[in-house]
Interface confidence: low
């Protein structure tokens, strides 16, 4: 399991806002945000990334296919770019991913999982925003 404490959080935030968020919202299109309760949370920026990584790339019995989605590919690229040594930890994970069956239908559980992901990303951004607000407060 990768330790996310040394990532460049600002760069990850920029990538999320620029592309990943749009792909997540596209995946959820036609689904209201109120359709699912957020049951997964995170308590700090590295912890949020740990949970995001787990939900995005670890298959669950009712949703095994998220890792092939566009938002997942972009998430992987972002983490590889801004988290030192992340790529090396993902070689085994990638090999395991290739063995998974493709699913043609976006199941309700996948939609629920992506809804949880959106919540985790928002929590990550909000924590980061708080950090930036505090720095701004100190410098003015």
């Amino acid at each position: 399991m990768y330790d996310f404490t040394n990532c460049d959080f600002q760069k990850i935030e920029a990538d999320y806002l620029r592309t990943i968020s749009k792909d997540l919202i596209t995946y959820m299109s036609g689904t209201k945000s109120t359709d699912f309760n957020n049951t997964v949370s995170c308590s700090n920026r590295p912890h949020c990334l740990t949970e995001i990584q787990s939900l995005t790339f670890n298959p669950t019995p009712r949703c095994a296919s998220l890792a092939k989605e566009m938002f997942a590919r972009k998430t992987k690229a972002t983490l590889a770019l801004w988290c030192p040594g992340y790529s090396e930890t993902q070689i085994n994970a990638t090999q395991a991913m290739k063995k998974r069956r493709k699913r043609k239908v976006t199941t309700n559980k996948c939609l629920e999982q992506v809804s949880q992901l959106l919540g985790l990303w928002r929590r990550f951004i909000r924590t980061l925003l708080k950090k930036q607000l505090e720095h701004h407060h100190h410098h003015h």
Partner: antibody, heavy 117, light 107 residues
Amino acid sequence: QVQLQQPGTELVKPGASVKMSCKASGYTFTTYWMHWVKQRPGQGLEWIGVIDPSDSDTTYNQKFKGKATLTVDTSSSTAYMQLSSLTSEDSAVYYCTRSLDGYYDYWGQGTTLTVSS
Amino acid sequence: DIQMTQSPASLSASVGETVTITCRPTENIYSYLAWYQQKQGKSPHLLVYFARTLAEGVPSRFSGSGSGTQFSLKINSLQPEDFGIYYCQHHYGTPWTFGGGTKLEIK
């Protein structure tokens, strides 16, 4: 400079409730989460719960659900913790402490709660 | 919940000595560990977070190390003001939990 001001002592009777305060200054109150920690005499530290002052989102330690209620008043930059149905087991020092990434960089001086008839 | 086991529970050392306190969580917490010092009748004071990052104003004789399920706090060349109780705390997720404390006394 950052300060978290707490009243020194609270003396209450068993079965009653108490609402203790924590007034923050020296930083933007809504920027940090506010946590509460319990320390019984001669004992270690126990996390009670956390509140996000920006939206009053709370998370409690399962052990303190129903015992502690966390609230904030952003207009006065004050966090509150109410403890109900007090017993001698609740006699302790209670600290408020701020956090962003789960570790606590500033602490209040603590409020000593004595539950006695 | 993640339990944090600190050792030793207490130790005596002389000024100038080097001491090491260890902390073992019951599960992998990566680098999400903080160390605090508490003096009698005072609030805890942050020393280290993310296992090895020294908090602002903390002297360089303090150092944190470890990851996963094994962590340590090392204090080089003990000073009179270093005596007190030391606590570890995981900040991986809720509920945040603390170790039982290590009482560092003057020999």
